[in-house]
Interface confidence: low
């Protein structure tokens, strides 16, 4: 037989706290134990679960745990079953709730001298005791004009008056604990002698010189006073109007009328109601003068056919907010279709060429109207008027390549030469019509040129080859003055190019023929052995059939090239002594001597007292100092050539003679004796 060693018993429990219903059984065979609540099996949850054969409650719940619990033990082999005694909880709880109006049915029905009943929706078990508060101050039962019914949880105000106005709250406590109202009730019972608002003035916006009306009404018993003030506290009455409110009228019903409104009338108007008791009520309204600013300019717009584009119209600042609409050709645009207005935007869907033109954005309010035009161009792909042609351009002259196209808007033209963009410079210029000008055609300008004409809608291009018609010219032009060394072999070259290979010949300027030792070999004048008679003026003539001939004049000078007769030597001089650097050159024409000291030419006119250059070319430096040390270069030059030679100058301290050395001992290095 199954025997219960411990049976569950009824007990007190606290809402939300732990509890345990015990159950222990003894049986000859294995049994399983389960629990019933009001006859239905209890399923385990995190809150309520079997603990061995007992039932454990992590947090008692007054709703889910009310009823009768029973422990059942069953032998699954024999089918024997035993049930414990019934057990239940006496759950103690308290739960907060709001303070609500019980009587009358709505706040709107609360009038002075009526009965008002408030209910405190705090509940619990055992039944709690209640305490009421007004504005945080406890109300005790039996005080004047109110009764507290703990049984019904009610507070009755009989009769209710302005002195009962305030914030009502309640608290309750029981053996379980304490709770206060979750939401409080504000009772507002107006004193009939207090001013109350019936009609409040509203802000108004009016155009200049129009009229404005403010309405204002208060009620009270006895009737309240009403006063209007302008923002600087100036009272407005029909008897005394401030200078800037001459056209103001206050009506018997409290309304204020302002006629022919000017900017100085704009501002805040205050309507003040004063009852027999209580504070004044101040109502405010602002009078705004309507205004509208100018609209910003639109940039012209270029769109492509077939695309969808939008143009936004920014409304001007204004009061009231200006309304905005778009027009085209004097007709207001619809709010749907292919070309339509959406909000402040002009929308052009699937643009056609016919959509081009002037569209106008309008903005208007009480203050007036503003408008702004936007010019819309529908771009087209360029078409050819004249393509660039393969051209022959003359060297040295300006050359032109056409690229004439038409489109909307005016197309932009760029040129390429050998696939490289031509940037305008001193040689290249692109005219407004697209034509390319090459200012001075050169041989290497003979190549491929390509022009591209574009608009936002697309581009076209074409190319042409330029052939340069080379002019007849010397390449290079012979030097007009040349020297030949006497008694030596000499050559004077002359070459030229042209559209056809030119023939080149030399002749003497006086027309006399060349001597036999002088030959003209394919333009090169060759002197086997130069004589004095070979000096003179010669002319190189280049000619071909189509271009005629050109001439270059050359003056040949026969010279004995420069040689040095005396060259300066490496020289060491004692400080304070005189240095002599000798230099003598010969040649024909007679060479001139110049000296360069320490990387600068020594100007004979600016040498100073210490330096002197002799007629024969030698350089003398008196009273030498260490800073005179360095390399000195002798430069000999005439109209035919220049030669130079250099030597170092060292300036040293004079040594002090030692005891062992006699007065005749030689110096340790070669010195100039002066």
């Amino acid at each position: 037989a199954i025997v219960f060693i411990k049976q569950p018993s009824s007990q007190d429990a606290l809402q939300g706290r732990r509890a345990l219903l015990r159950c222990e059984v003894e049986a000859p065979g294995p049994v399983h134990v389960y629990w019933l609540l009001d006859g239905a099996p209890v399923q385990d949850t995190e809150r309520r679960f079997a603990q061995g054969s007992s039932l454990s409650f992590a947090a008692v719940d007054r709703l889910q745990d009310s009823g009768t619990f029973q422990c059942v033990a069953r032998d699954d082999v024999t089918g024997e079953e035993a049930r414990s005694a019934n057990a239940s909880f006496n759950i103690k709880w308290i739960e907060a709730g709001p303070v609500v109006l019980k009587h009358p049915a709505s706040e709107a029905e609360i009038q002075p001298q009526t009965q008002v009943t408030l209910r405190c929706h705090i509940d619990g078990h055992p039944r709690p005791t209640y305490q009421w508060f007004r504005d945080g101050t406890p109300l005790s039962d039996g005080q004047s004009n109110h009764t507290v019914s703990s049984k019904e949880r009610n507070l009755t105000l009989r009769p209710a008056g302005p002195e009962h106005s305030g914030l009502y709250s309640c608290c309750a406590h029981s053996a379980f604990g304490q709770a206060c109202s979750s939401q409080n009730f504000t009772l507002s019972i107006a004193d009939e002698s207090f001013a109350r608002v019936v009609l409040a003035p509203q802000d108004v916006v009016v155009a200049r010189y129009e009229e404005a009306m403010f309405h204002c009404q208060f009620s009270a018993q006895p009737p309240p006073s009403l006063q209007w003030l302008f923002e600087d506290e100036t009272p407005i009455t029909n008897r005394s109007r401030p200078p800037h409110l001459r056209r103001a009228t206050v009506f018997a019903n409290g309304s204020l009328l302002l006629t022919q409104v000017r900017p100085r009338n704009a501002g805040i108007y205050r309507c003040i109601g004063q009852g027999q008791r209580g504070p004044p009520i101040i109502l405010e309204a602002t009078l705004h003068l309507a205004e509208i600013e100018d609209m910003p300019l639109f940039e012209p717009r270029v769109f492509t056919a077939g695309s969808e584009e939008r143009v936004t119209c920014l409304p001007p600042k204004g009061l009231p907010e200006p309304s905005v609409w778009w027009e085209h050709a004097g007709v207001r645009l619809p709010t749907h279709g292919r070309v339509y207005q959406k909000g402040h935007e002009l929308v052009l869907a699937n643009i056609a060429e016919s959509d081009a033109g002037v569209y106008t954005c309008h903005a208007a309010n009480l203050a007036g109207q503003r408008r702004q035009d936007v010019n819309i161009t529908v771009a087209t792909v360029p078409s050819w008027l004249k393509k660039p042609q393969d051209s022959q351009l003359e060297e040295g002259k300006p050359g032109y390549l056409d690229c004439l196209t038409q489109a909307t808007p005016k197309p932009t033209v760029v040129w390429y030469r050998n696939q490289m963009l031509i940037s305008e410079d001193s040689r290249f210029e692109v005219f407004k019509n697209g034509t390319l000008r090459i200012n001075s055609v050169e041989v290497y300008d003979g190549t491929w040129y390509r022009c591209m004409s574009s608009t936002p809608a697309g581009s076209i291009e074409a190319q042409a080859r330029v052939q340069v018609l080379e002019k007849l010219k010397f390449t290079p032009p012979p030097q007009p003055q040349q020297c030949m060394e006497f008694d030596k072999e000499a050559t004077v070259p002359c070459s030229a190019t042209g559209r056809e290979k030119p023939t080149i010949k030399w002749e003497r300027a006086d027309g006399s023929s060349l001597p036999e030792w002088v030959t003209d070999n394919a333009g090169t004048l060759h002197f086997a052995r130069v004589t004095r008679d070979d000096a003179g003026n010669y002319t190189c003539i280049a000619s071909n059939g189509p271009q005629g001939q050109i001439r270059a004049h050359v003056q040949l000078t026969v010279a004995v090239f420069i040689t040095f007769k005396v060259e300066p030597e490496r020289t060491t001089v004692y400080q304070g002594h005189t240095a002599l650097l000798q230099c003598e050159a010969q040649g024909d024409p007679k060479p001139l001597i110049q000296w360069k000291g320490k990387d600068r030419i020594l100007d004979p006119t600016k040498l100073g007292p210490r330096m002197h250059i002799f007629q024969n070319g030698s350089l003398v430096i008196h009273d030498v100092a260490p800073e005179d040390s360095g390399r000195y270069t002798c430069i000999a030059g005439n109209s035919c050539n220049i030669k130079h030679t250099e030597a170092p100058l060292y300036v040293v301290d004079k040594p002090v003679p030692e005891e062992s050395e006699g007065p005749g001992s030689p110096p340790p290095y070669k010195m100039i004796q002066t």
Epitope: A200, G267, I268, P279, I281, I282, E284, T286
Partner: nanobody, 124 residues
Framework: QVQLQESGGGLVQPGGSLTLACAAS????????MRWVRQAPGKGLEGVSS????????YYADFAKGRFTISRDNAKNTLYLQLNSLKTEDTAMYYC?????????????????VGQGTQVTVSS
């Protein structure tokens, strides 16, 4: 809800001084301009002085200039009005009023911007 409680009024002889205080609650005091207004017996309401939210701007009616000083302590949510050189014509109920967040000169008042007031009586 907005609550304003004036204090500091009383009976004073001509030439005397008083300091009125206004304790504010139920709104962000430091964000609003504040103002003193008064109502003499049998007369309309008139502005006395106003002060910006930060206390850096003040305005006075002509009769108050040089005699009255408005100030505020945002840490204590309190508005003050120092009344000096009082005259018999300064006798009135003095109210404190909540302005708006803008300039104190043109503060937009709510419908019932004032407390219950404090009575100042100047009499010999």
């Amino acid at each position: 809800q907005v609550q304003l409680q004036e204090s500091g009024g009383g009976l004073v002889q001509p030439g005397g001084s008083l300091t009125l205080a206004c304790a504010a609650s139920g709104f962000a005091f430091s964000s609003y301009a504040m103002r003193w207004v008064r109502q003499a017996p049998g007369k309309g309401l008139e502005g006395v002085s106003s002060i910006s939210a930060g206390g850096d701007e003040t305005y006075y009616a002509d009769f108050a200039k040089g005699r009255f000083t408005i100030s505020r302590d945002n840490a204590k949510n309190t508005l003050y009005l120092q009344l000096n050189s009082l005259k018999t014509e300064d006798t009135a109920m003095y109210y404190c009023a909540k302005g708006d967040r803008n300039s104190p000169r043109y503060s937009s008042w709510p419908i019932t911007p004032v407390g219950q007031g404090t009575q100042v009586t100047v009499s010999s």
